[in-house]
Interface confidence: low
């Protein structure tokens, strides 16, 4: 293939491939019809002069994961069709002005994962067709104004894993085509008031794991067409109320792990397209009437690990859309029987670790698509008469880890589980807390001979008489986890975490999908 | 200090039943899984069961014939097999959590006539 | 049932030297990221000891010469200085999904 170096190989489709820790140069002499060319894990610690003169139609070439240290001005001399250029994951620490120099085909410039400690406005003055401009996983500490205002043309800037403390307003004021803006991991304590405004074609904000502590109202008035913004463990401990008032467009948005203690009515929205919000890991106390309200199409709704302790029953007005809520790990004792009313197509709802002393009867009551009920670690002793009745396709309810109160009131739940076994799979089976003659014993076995009168007055509705047949033999096999389901998940129902650490964030939150900020 | 200190040497006809105990120690009893396993002489390991307050999970093989149960108050742990045969003869572990972290010293059952 | 196969079934080596067991399991036993693979040690008249657990985690009080790797179906425990004190039969075992199940033991041996 017109004269291929012997530690690469080079294909019919003029690609050439060289990889490996014996090569220590640019390997010569590389065939000269060469588009793609790639220099992969070799031991190569700079670029000379002009090692690619002879393959000008050159139009991608990567140098990555090699040991590349210092590049000579004139490095990329001669290759004017290039589109795509990797320097990602070398350990460049200075980039020489005009390296770039020539390069007018340019789309794509990959200079992430090296040890770049700055960047000039030269470096990129050249760039005009640039596309494409990754930086993240470097040392950089500021962006000097000026820096990208020549390449108009940019949608993707990813500037994440770096040390920038703060960013000029004007540092991306001419970015008009950004559709990327990448700021994650850094340091950044506060954003201008203006700095977005330039970005009026802007889809993705990424902030998140930065420092921020207070969001200026205006911030985001001009990004119209955000679709995803990620504004997760910063330090943000209130939202202005109207700084998300301009995003029409938004389909995601993360809030995690941030300091907030309440939501104003009204802060979200209008959001027609938002589809998930994430608010868990703040210190939210409250949810008032109508806080969603604006969030017509949401789907996925997580604010556990907060210490909401009051939900107004008008909290999740407007939620007609809402599959997944999760409420766990939070401050709640009671909530009010209409409270999920709006919520027709909810599948999942978590709510387990929290200090739910009861529940009212009707409070699944629209909910009649619900799948997975999680109200395990609360405080309930007993529950409703037909509280889950209606509920045809619930196929997994958590009730471990209550105090269950094991006298006759509980027969009828007794029975229902019995009756539900195979259906619902329990993992791990409630235990009886209560009287002491039965303490420890697993709710769903207690002997009716055993199981003491109630000498209370019952906080749920007495339930009428509900025929059992211990000796059934059709019954599942009551002293075990149901037989139906296998123990796939035991990291989740009963291994000590100290043990070991899951990184999976969906068994942390009782959440059902992966996702991430 | 962990311990699970197992009864002591059973020797049983076939036919019977025979329970043994697992006493835990130095932790808090409730919180862990604790496993029954057992041993043929010479032989491998094979899993019987788990108990964990009060839910229960067998080995299919053994299904029917081990019977786990524990008591709280005493920290302790109880199997029970029935209907013994030769082929019973083995030693049997307790040990606890997921892991299998700590054993105890095992409890040799003999069944022969 | 997810059947564990161990090899060698013995394994002669000399001390200070590198000793490597190998375990394969009939199906993935990866679950949340996580292989739930663990290694066991048992020396005559005694019960087993926890060295690793979920793949490449060692257990308390484990000496840094065992390390455990692999994920999905393959795994290996090794030993990267034999001591006279490690004599013994090791065991894999998964505890992916019940019925937990163990390989059937390797023998190591000083030669």
């Known amino acids: 293939y017109h004269g291929c170096p012997s530690e690469c190989t080079c294909s019919r489709a003029s690609q050439v491939e060289c990889t490996g820790a014996r090569i220590v140069a640019v390997p010569t002499p590389l065939p000269w019809n060469a588009m793609s060319l790639q220099i992969l894990n070799t031991h190569i610690t700079e670029l000379n002069e002009s090692p690619f003169l002879n393959i000008s139609a050159l139009i991608a070439l990567r140098i990555e994961k090699n040991e590349l240290s210092r590049i000579t001005p004139g490095a990329f001399r001669n290759l004017g069709s290039l589109r795509y250029l990797s320097l990602a994951n070398n350990k460049l620490q200075v980039l020489p002005i005009g390296l770039f120099q020539g390069l007018d085909s340019l789309e794509s410039l990959l200079l992430s994962s090296n040890q770049l400690l700055q960047i000039q406005p030269a470096h990129f003055s050249q760039c005009s067709n640039l596309k494409e401009l990754q930086l993240h996983g470097n040392h950089l500490e500021y962006i000097p104004d000026g820096a990208f205002d020549h390449l108009v043309g940019l949608t993707k800037l990813n500037l994440g894993k770096n040390s920038l403390t703060h960013i000029s307003p004007r540092v991306f004021q001419h970015l008009g085509n950004l559709q990327v803006l990448r700021l994650y991991e850094n340091r950044l304590t506060d954003i201008p008031m203006g700095t977005f405004d330039g970005l009026v074609n802007l889809q993705e904000l990424a902030l998140q794991q930065n420092q921020i502590g207070l969001l200026s109202p205006g911030l985001f008035h001009n990004n119209h067409n955000l679709q995803r913004l990620y504004l997760s463990n910063n330090h943000i401990s209130q939202l202005p109320p109207s700084v998300f008032m301009q995003l029409p467009q938004l389909n995601r948005l993360t809030l995690f792990g941030n300091s907030l203690k309440e939501l104003s009515p009204g802060i979200f929205g209008p959001m027609p397209n938002l589809r998930e919000l994430w608010l868990y890991d703040n210190h939210i106390s409250s949810l008032p009437d109508n806080v969603f309200s604006n969030l017509r199409q949401l789907q996925v709704l997580i604010l556990s690990r907060n210490q909401i302790s009051f939900i107004s029953p008008g909290a999740f007005n407007g939620l007609t859309e809402l599959r997944e809520l999760s409420l766990h790990t939070n401050a709640l004792q009671d909530l009010d029987g209409n409270v999920f009313r709006m919520l027709a197509n909810l599948q999942n709802i978590s709510l387990q670790n929290n200090r739910l002393r009861q529940l009212p009867g009707n409070i699944f009551a629209n909910v009649n698509g619900l799948m997975a009920i999680q109200l395990q670690n609360n405080q309930l002793e007993n529950l409703p008469l037909g509280i889950f009745d209606h509920l045809g396709k619930l196929c997994e309810l958590r009730l471990y880890d209550n105090p269950w109160r094991c006298d006759s009131d509980i027969l009828p739940l007794r029975n229902w589980l019995l009756l539900n076994q195979p259906r619902l799979g329990t993992d791990t089976v409630p235990v009886c807390f209560s009287p002491a003659n039965v303490r420890g014993q697993s709710l769903i076995i207690i002997n009716v001979n055993v199981a003491v009168p109630s000498v209370h007055v019952p906080e749920v509705p007495s339930y009428p008489e509900t025929p059992w047949y211990p000796d059934t033999p059709s019954y599942p096999d009551t002293t075990s986890v149901s037989s139906t389901t296998e123990l796939t998940s035991p990291v989740e129902d009963y291994t000590d975490l100290t043990t070991i650490q899951v990184t999976d964030d969906r068994s942390v939150w009782g959440m059902t999908q992966a996702q991430s900020g | 200090e962990v311990q699970l200190q197992q009864s002591g040497p059973e020797l049983v006809k076939p036919g019977a039943s025979v329970k043994m105990s697992c006493k835990a120690s130095?932790?808090?009893?409730?919180?862990?899984?604790i496993h029954w396993v057992k041993q043929m002489p010479g032989q491998g390991l094979e899993w019987i069961a788990y108990i964990y307050n009060d839910g229960t999970k067998y080995n299919e093989k053994f299904r029917g014939r081990a019977t786990l149960t524990s008591d709280k108050s005493s920290s302790t742990a109880y199997m029970e097999l029935n209907s013994l045969t030769s082929e019973d003869s083995a030693v049997y572990y307790c040990?606890?959590?997921?892991?299998?972290?700590?054993w105890g010293q095992g409890t040799t059952l003999t069944v022969s006539s | 049932d997810i059947v564990m196969t161990q090899s060698p079934d013995s394994l002669a080596v000399s001390l200070g030297e590198r000793a490597t067991i190998n375990c394969r399991a009939s199906e993935s036993v990866d679950y949340y990221g996580i292989s739930f693979m663990n290694w066991y040690q048992q020396k005559p008249g005694q019960p087993p000891k926890l060295l690793i657990y979920?793949?490449?985690n060692q257990g308390s009080g484990v000496p840094d010469r065992f390390s455990g790797s692999g994920s999905g179906t393959d795994f290996t425990l090794t030993i990267s200085s034999l001591q006279a004190e490690d004599v013994a039969v090791y065991y894999c075992q998964q505890s992916k999904e019940v019925p937990y199940t163990f390989g059937g033991g390797t023998k190591v041996e000083i030669k």
């Open positions: 130095g932790y808090t009893f409730t919180s862990f899984v």
């Open positions: 979920a793949a490449s």
């Open positions: 040990a606890r959590d997921f892991y299998f972290d700590y």
